[in-house]
């Protein structure tokens, strides 16, 4: 975070949508009001949501937005009828601009979009469309929520009657009717090439007060397939004035975005005044918390048939308009500790916001490089008790590479968990990481000004004098279906080794190729030799969408003075390159494309060695590496055997057993658990209905006591 | 006020189709799970299968190729189908509202249950 | 699939306190449920997650695990208990998902 002295007052900064002034002589823009006395606030801290009543006296009415809405209390309204839009499917204009504002991101609409219908007391004209997110991993961002449920991302398109007012602004400042549009975004496995033209614009404003002309879109094309189930409310603006006089229509269905979509949004920059002190900080979880309904009432539309199928219309559609097809956000909080000298503890927290609950077992690969040998493992973990494993066996003088996928009881995935880094017999460790899509993996040091602190901290442990360092990788990974044919450990060998040299050297390349194309799937129970697969290059991988050549327009419609100071690269990475990340959760970031997936017909399926549950202390030996890595779920409750010679008897161990040994049986061995990965990539439960519910994780409901927990050392892969 | 009630219990001969339908009120199929589940008399609970809120169906092993779960979102009714039925399937079949918590599931609201005999 | 054993019946005193045991023959690490089954009704949740009671539930019953087993406890038994308790858990993910019930133990309260 940097921090500077402001010499402006401090209260003066202007609303989200204040729109006034001319821009090029053109229409009117978002311009902080700094000299015109409007209240500052802020989503957090004393400026907060709580304290917004203070000086805006309307944020403390009764009917207030945004809300929760119960869908079994809204009644239908008859005069809730089809919406008419016109001017929707037309492209934008390239004046068409966008505005980092601080408090969100803006479009300012400069084409004739207008609304009726649905209740609206006229013909509504479309002005602005601002957004809302969480923090990282399609964690909660939407203002409105459906049933409880909140969504990634919430787009808002305000209106405003042009035959009562010349001006949004002046609808606004005589606290009259203007009409609100809600639509939430939800995590889609592919990116929505819609959203390419908002996505690419982002990249041009990710610092407070960027501005850039957009791209040509459709704006039907941002608003759900099917507009026939909406809900009507009136509220409020959501934020300061606050005033009372929105007309909202939320629509019931979301819009897909992929996580690397996403990934724009959360790469948003804002300054933050506190007293006269001004930081700049990421622009994230800029939502205002829900309001009372009072004596409200929600309604929905009468739509014939809107609300009644079954949803596999749109299911049908490979994006879904209900876009998740993941099982959670990824699990958080990655850990990786030393046991002993041979043992490694890997522990890992709920992913905070699962759509498809409950997770019923997590799947943890790791990755190790020796002597140029590359190997990858898979192994699932029974549920979801006891967040940790053991892995055992582990060689001091190898790399290796930790990472977490939480599997729900319908067989998907979620995303991959931040990756983590183990080297043993290493006392210089990274300072810091910063991910950078590259054409080709280099290792060098970075400059302080580009470091990223590492969630977990750095650490070293020591034992009998082997020191074991270990570094968190500010890695998204890219979705659940990403990846290519080379280990992460194959990489590691050529960019990452050398940094561990550097003291504070940076990571510049962690190409998506360094995981393998395809990972078993969930129900797969089987554990195979890992075997050596070809190390690739990151020019492999299929461009991501916004992997153009063509420089970005960012700077474009900033004004005299305002040029970027440096362009956005090509790839799309965050501009903010200077700044390093807030903390913990800001890491999670994808910085590779998604490879091409093709790949993952070509692979030959392994065959499992036997069709029965891992056999609890049984594994193969992996040739070429001599001595086996053992991963076994950490059972603090019992049902331990005892532990082998210089390990800890926390552990269970394993004999060795030749590579194409079949696994032990054992009392308990499951023989109808399919132990054949699957090529599909989800084998059942991949429809996901537009009213599937997720579950945003109550911290009070991590209890991590355990009944019944399966030892079994895993199926290992 | 939230409930559930089975029907389509009855006589049944040996080798016949049976159809349950469970239809539900006060909650929405579309944002809740439903399990069957079975006993036979003087025996336990035996679960039979469920059908989540996306639709997506999961079975028993005894109950995978001669069950079928589906469900009516718009009519609120989830319909069990079992096949070449015998006598051991004489059992009180209840549907039950699942709580599905973010690693746990449970079955929170049972619905009265319905008789069925298999009997020629 | 794993199998959750229950002592078929279980005797405890009026006013005592009496322990319910639920073992699993191979470790699921799927939280364990609860439930009373009283004759001629339908069963009604007790416990989940291991240990945390739905509203209603009167606090005398309470949940907890180690290991491989399961416990439910009744302290204070009343005749109003007599009945039958199950417990169950759920396991595996997508065709291999599995929802298992104990044989159950039927509680007899005397005196």
């Known amino acids: 975070v940097l921090h500077y002295v402001v010499c402006f007052p401090a209260l003066t900064e202007g609303y989200v949508g204040a729109l006034h002034e001319n821009r090029h002589g053109s229409a009117v823009q978002i311009r902080r009001r700094k000299a015109s006395g409007d209240p500052y606030w802020a989503y957090s801290g004393a400026y907060g949501p709580e304290h917004w009543v203070t000086s805006s006296v309307s944020c403390g009415g009764r009917h207030q937005s945004p809300i929760d809405i119960l869908d079994q209390y809204a009644r239908v309204g008859e005069e809730y009828q089809e919406l008419q839009l016109d001017g929707f499917d037309n492209e934008s204009s390239n004046k068409t601009w966008m505005k980092n504002t601080g408090k969100t991101v803006a479009i300012l609409l400069k084409d004739d979009y207008f609304v009726s219908g649905a209740g609206l007391p006229g013909r509504f004209k479309a002005e602005k469309v601002e957004f809302h997110w969480g923090h990282s991993n399609g964690s909660a961002g939407s203002e409105h929520s459906i049933n409880g449920r909140r969504f990634p991302v919430e787009m808002q398109i305000f209106f405003y009657n042009p035959d009562d007012f010349d001006s949004f602004q002046t609808a606004i400042s005589e606290n009259r009717i203007i009409g609100a549009m809600a639509i939430f975004f939800q995590v889609s496995p592919r990116d929505n090439s819609a959203l390419d033209p908002i996505i690419h614009g982002l990249k041009g404003v990710v610092h407070h007060e960027k501005e850039t002309f957009l791209d040509p879109f459709v704006l039907r094309d941002l608003l759900p397939a099917s507009l026939g189930s909406y809900y009507r409310y009136t509220g409020s603006l959501t934020t300061p004035p606050c005033s009372e006089i929105v007309e909202w229509i939320v629509f019931r269905r979301p819009v897909p975005i992929s996580y690397h979509q996403l990934e724009a949004f959360y790469s948003i920059f804002t300054t933050e005044q506190q007293d006269h002190v001004k930081s700049v900080e990421y622009l994230r979880n800029n939502f205002r918390p829900q309001q009372r309904l009072h004596d409200r009432v929600v309604s929905k539309s009468a739509v014939r048939d809107s609300w009644n199928h079954d949803m596999t219309d749109f299911l049908e559609n490979p994006l879904g308009t209900e876009a998740s097809k993941v099982c959670s956000s990824p699990p958080i909080h990655m850990k990786v500790q030393p046991l002993n000298q041979t043992a490694l503890q890997v522990s890992w927290s709920q992913p905070e916001t699962i759509y498809h609950p409950p997770i019923m077992n997590y799947m943890i690969s790791y990755s190790w490089t020796k002597n140029e040998d590359e190997k990858e493992k898979t192994f699932t973990k029974d549920s979801d008790k006891d967040l940790k494993a053991t892995i055992s066996h582990v060689s001091p003088d190898s790399l290796y590479l930790f990472r977490v996928q939480a599997v729900c009881r319908n067989d998907m995935r979620s995303d991959f968990s931040q990756t983590m880094l183990f080297q043993a017999n290493t006392t210089r460790i990274f300072q810091g990481t910063r991910i950078v899509k590259t054409g080709v993996p280099t290792a060098s040091p970075a400059s302080s000004a580009d470091m990223a602190p590492i969630s977990s901290g750095s650490s070293t442990w020591t034992s009998s004098g082997i020191p074991f360092s270990f570094v968190s990788m500010a890695t998204g990974m890219g979705p659940s279906s990403s990846g290519s044919q080379a280990t992460v450990a194959s990489v590691v060998t050529s960019t990452l080794l050398a940094g561990l040299g550097f003291g504070g050297g940076g990571i510049s390349s962690f190409p998506s190729t360094v995981w393998p194309t395809r990972l078993p799937t969930a129900a797969s129970a089987s554990k195979q030799a890992a075997r050596p697969v070809l190390a690739t290059t990151e020019a492999l991988a299929s461009p991501g969408p916004d992997g153009d050549s063509s420089p970005t327009k960012d700077g474009e419609g900033t004004e005299e003075g305002e040029k970027d100071e440096k362009s956005e690269s090509e790839d799309g990475e965050r501009e903010h390159e200077e700044d390093g990340e807030k903390d913990s959760e800001k890491k999670e970031k994808s910085g590779v494309t998604h490879a091409a997936e093709e790949r993952n017909q070509t692979e030959p399926s392994p065959t499992p060695s036997s069709p029965n549950r891992t056999a609890e202390g049984g594994h193969q030996t992996i040739p070429g590496h001599e001595q086996d890595h053992t991963a076994v779920p950490t059972d603090q409750t019992g049902g331990r055997r005892d532990a082998g010679p210089g390990l800890d008897p926390d552990m269970v161990t394993s004999t060795q057993v030749p590579p194409t040994a079949t696994e032990e049986q054992y009392a308990g061995s499951d023989p109808k658990r399919p132990e054949m990965p699957s090529k599909k990539p989800m084998s059942r439960g991949d429809r996901f209905s537009e009213d599937s519910r997720f579950i945003t994780v109550n911290p009070a409901e991590k209890n991590t006591s355990g009944m019944i927990s399966r030892p079994a050392p895993g199926r290992m892969e | 006020q939230e409930q559930q009630k089975e029907s389509g219990g009855g006589l049944f001969k040996p080798t016949d189709t049976l159809t349950l339908t469970c239809t539900v009120s006060?909650?929405?199929?579309?944002?809740?799970?439903i399990s069957w589940v079975r006993q036979a008399p003087g025996n336990g609970l035996e679960w039979i299968g469920a059908?989540?809120?996306?639709?997506?169906?999961y079975y028993a092993t005894w109950a995978k190729g001669r069950s079928t779960i589906t469900r009516a979102t718009n009519l609120n009714t989830v319909t069990l189908k079992m096949t070449s039925v015998t006598a051991a399937d004489t059992a009180t079949y209840f549907c039950?509202?699942?709580?599905?918590?973010?690693?746990?599931?449970?079955?929170?609201?049972w619905g009265p249950g319905t008789l069925v005999t298999i009997s020629s | 699939s794993f199998v959750l054993t229950q002592p078929a019946s279980v005797q405890v005193n009026l006013g005592q306190t009496v322990s319910l045991t639920c073992t699993a023959d191979?470790?699921?690490?799927?939280?364990a449920s609860w439930y009373q089954q009283k004759p001629g009704q339908a069963p009604v949740l007790l416990i989940y997650r291991d240990t945390s009671r739905p509203s209603g539930v009167p606090d005398r019953f309470s949940g907890s695990s180690s290991g491989n087993t399961a416990t439910l406890t009744i302290s204070g038994a009343q005749a109003g208990d007599e009945a039958d308790y199950y417990c169950?858990?759920?396991?595996?993910?997508?065709?291999?998902?599995?929802?298992?019930f104990g044989g159950g133990t039927q509680l007899t309260v005397t005196g």
């Open positions: 191979t470790l699921s690490r799927s939280y």
């Open positions: 039950a509202r699942e709580d599905v918590r973010a690693d746990s599931i449970d079955l929170n609201m």
């Open positions: 169950a858990t759920s396991d595996g993910s997508g065709s291999s998902y599995q929802f298992v």
């Open positions: 006060g909650f929405s199929l579309s944002s809740n799970a």
């Open positions: 059908i989540d809120n996306s639709g997506s169906a």
